[in-house]
């Protein structure tokens, strides 16, 4: 007899886009409309919740911009929280200082992406230092992952 | 009887590098020589043409440089076109303003990468705002994707 | 008879983090402690050694910073060496010039990531132009790959 048909497992993947009603950290994300993907991973209060242990490529981009450059330090972090551990683990981080000419209109992006071994129930979040300087266009600011 | 040997499907993948004879938008790419990859995806007039619906990680880097900085706004977009839709969809975008000291020789890169659900016949392109400021070295400016 | 159980192959993956005792090029990496991954790939004297030919997504981020900006040109390269070839092949590269305000404390990252067809025994390395300006925090400076 031929082998049973292969059960095609749903790929665990997420691509969430900027949500302009973020008021505090961590950033909140659009998980429903536009070019969003969410499959085999849950979204909860700004976080992507892993439900299967394994290797994941995790990425995020944040678009910072302002009208009158004051060169406030900018930071962009992807971090992980798990109830088993007392402290957040910063997985990836980007920092910028002295990045524009004082007083000028400016714009700059930070991109992060890498592979991590994640455990079921890990929660992944994105944090920025200056929320007021983030632009939330879906093509400019995003957060995603996929299971290898 | 034992099952037939597994047919190893060719991985759908592309990595195209900068082509200095780009004269207009979208950017054109080297699809033959050097560290180029093109398998299970077609290249046509600057675009990567998807021939199988599914999840893809899409990425691009563009290297901008100039002899005398005048801080022209720079943009770098990956966008999608499909004959079923009247308008291009910007998938990912990076913008830079006020990024160098007036009059100085300068150099800067923009990197984009994320996961998208693409449909057979989608055409993917890269657009930049200032073609004359792009350097097309194969290690510096590129465009690629692979099917998850 | 039913087919033999599928042998689950270990995913070939690496994520190495910054190691502050790098004294010369190529950069050296932390391959044991922290959020490091190393499976099906070897680490040797700063390099990731491929032991199975195939398609790999390769990435690196380097975090540059300084106390008093003098706009030294910065470069960040991922390159490949193989005993069959006389010369290193630069796979990806980022350059920065005129990126901060003279005399100011500054910080900036460079991110690279793309797909390559690698051959067994290829050695991959990361090079930077100004070692003294690199910060080696594990979340900020890293080097990784995975087999597609």
């Amino acid at each position: 007899p031929s082998p049973p048909p292969e059960k095609k497992e749903l790929r665990k993947v997420a691509h969430l886009t900027g949500k302009s009603n973020s008021r505090s950290m961590p950033l909140e994300w659009e998980d429903t409309y536009g070019i969003v993907l969410l499959s085999g991973v849950k979204y909860k209060k700004g976080g992507l919740v892993i439900n299967e242990t394994g290797l994941y490529f995790v990425y995020s981009k944040v678009y910072f911009r302002g009208q009158s450059c004051n060169n406030l330090p900018l930071s962009h972090k992807v971090y992980m929280r798990n109830s088993k551990y007392p402290q957040d683990l910063v997985m990836m981080e980007g920092k910028m200082m002295s990045y524009c000419t004082t007083g000028q209109m400016w714009a700059r992006s930070s991109y992060l992406g890498a592979v991590f071994n994640l455990t079921s129930a890990d929660h992944l979040y994105v944090n920025v230092s200056e929320l007021s300087l983030v632009n939330f266009e879906e093509s400019q600011t995003f957060f995603g992952l996929y299971k290898l | 009887p034992s099952p037939p040997p597994e047919k190893k499907e060719l991985r759908k993948v592309a990595h195209l590098t900068g082509k200095s004879n780009s004269r207009s938008m979208p950017l054109e790419w080297e699809d033959t020589y050097g560290i180029v990859l093109l398998s299970g995806v077609k290249y046509k007039k600057g675009g990567l043409v998807i021939n199988e619906t599914g999840l893809y990680f899409v990425y691009s880097k563009v290297y901008f440089r100039g002899q005398s900085c005048n801080n022209l706004p720079l943009s770098h977009k990956v966008y999608m076109r499909n004959s079923k839709y009247p308008q291009d969809l910007v998938m990912m975008e990076g913008k830079m303003m006020s990024y160098c000291t007036t009059g100085q020789m300068w150099a800067r890169s923009s990197y984009l990468g994320a996961v998208f659900n693409l449909t057979s016949a989608d055409h993917l392109y890269v657009n930049v705002s200032e073609l004359s400021l792009v350097n097309f070295e194969e290690s510096q400016t590129f465009f690629g994707l692979y099917k998850l | 008879p039913s087919p033999p159980p599928e042998k689950k192959e270990l995913r070939k993956v690496a994520h190495l983090t910054g190691k502050s005792n790098s004294r010369s090029m190529p950069l050296e990496w932390e391959d044991t402690y922290g959020i490091v991954l190393l499976s099906g790939v070897k680490y040797k004297k700063g390099g990731l050694v491929i032991n199975e030919t195939g398609l790999y997504f390769v990435y690196s981020k380097v975090y540059f910073r300084g106390q008093s900006c003098n706009n030294l040109p910065l470069s960040h390269k991922v390159y490949m060496r193989n005993s069959k070839y006389p010369q290193d092949l630069v796979m990806m590269e980022g350059k920065m010039m005129s990126y901060c305000t003279t005399g100011q404390m500054w910080a900036r990252s460079s991110y690279l990531g793309a797909v390559f067809n690698l051959t067994s025994a290829d050695h991959l390395y990361v090079n930077v132009s100004e070692l003294s300006l690199v910060n080696f925090e594990e979340s900020q400076t890293f080097f990784g790959l995975y087999k597609l």
Epitope: Q67, S68, N70, S98, T102, G103, Q104, S132 | P73 | -
Partner: antibody
């Protein structure tokens, strides 16, 4: 409440320098770039320049280079502007104004400092 | 630099009527979907006060009788219905690039 308090009026002789101050209160001083504006009868309002209250470097209108020098003291939340080699043309009211980087315009202004140059 | 030309230099409007002030820029002050034009009100002995930012957005605490419109190079400030307390000088100002410039001002009198 948010306030930008400028130093008092100055009556000075031609050829000397004057340094005027602008103290911010009611907000995080280093979060906002500080701009300076000149108002004279002859030329309405003129933008002089801007200083980063965070890192202390300034950007000047070409017309005021060599005339104005902007500095900042983060510890006292105060911005300063020194005007050099004064002439009667420099007689005017000088304003400081903060500019939120995430906004479009100068939202709070100091009350102004009158500088009169006369022999 | 971008030159802003305001007109009229002065106008007198009856209480309750509409006052319209124009500002023309020597080049576009638009970028990326926004118009970088602002309007200020200044009364004697006081600093300028922000009324309208980004061409048409009312600053917090400013009465709704003030409105702004326009894009590119042509912008308008409207006040309707004019009230006694609106007697002042009005300035347009762009923040598209450095150096910022201001219009010459329009003095509004209430009849």
């Amino acid at each position: 409440q948010i306030q930008l308090l400028q130093s008092g009026a100055e009556l000075v002789r031609p050829g000397v320098s004057v340094k005027i101050s602008c103290k911010g209160s009611g907000y995080t001083f280093t979060d906002y770039a500080m701009h300076w504006v000149k108002q004279s009868h002859a030329k309405s309002l003129e933008w002089i320049g801007v200083i980063s209250t965070y890192q202390g470097d300034a950007n000047y209108n070409q017309k005021f280079k060599g005339k104005a020098t902007m500095t900042v003291d983060k510890s006292s939340s105060t911005a300063y502007m020194e005007l050099a080699r004064l002439t009667s043309e420099d007689s005017a009211i000088y304003y400081c104004a903060r500019f939120p980087d995430w906004d479009y315009a100068m939202d709070y202004w100091g009350q102004g400092t009158s500088v009169t140059v006369s022999s | 630099e971008i030159v802003l030309t305001q007109s009229p230099a002065s106008l007198a409007v009856s209480l309750g009527q509409r006052a319209t002030i124009s500002c023309k820029a020597s080049q576009s002050v638009d970028y990326d979907g926004d118009s970088y034009m602002n309007w200020y009100q200044q009364k004697p002995g006081q600093p300028p006060k922000l009324l309208i930012y980004a061409a048409s957005n009312l600053e917090s605490g400013i009465p709704a009788r003030f409105s702004g419109s326009g894009s590119g190079t042509d912008f308008t400030l409207n006040i309707h219905p004019v009230e006694e307390e609106d007697a002042a000088t009005y300035y347009c100002q762009h923040s598209r690039e450095l150096p910022y410039t201001f219009g010459g001002g329009t003095k509004l009198e209430i009849k």
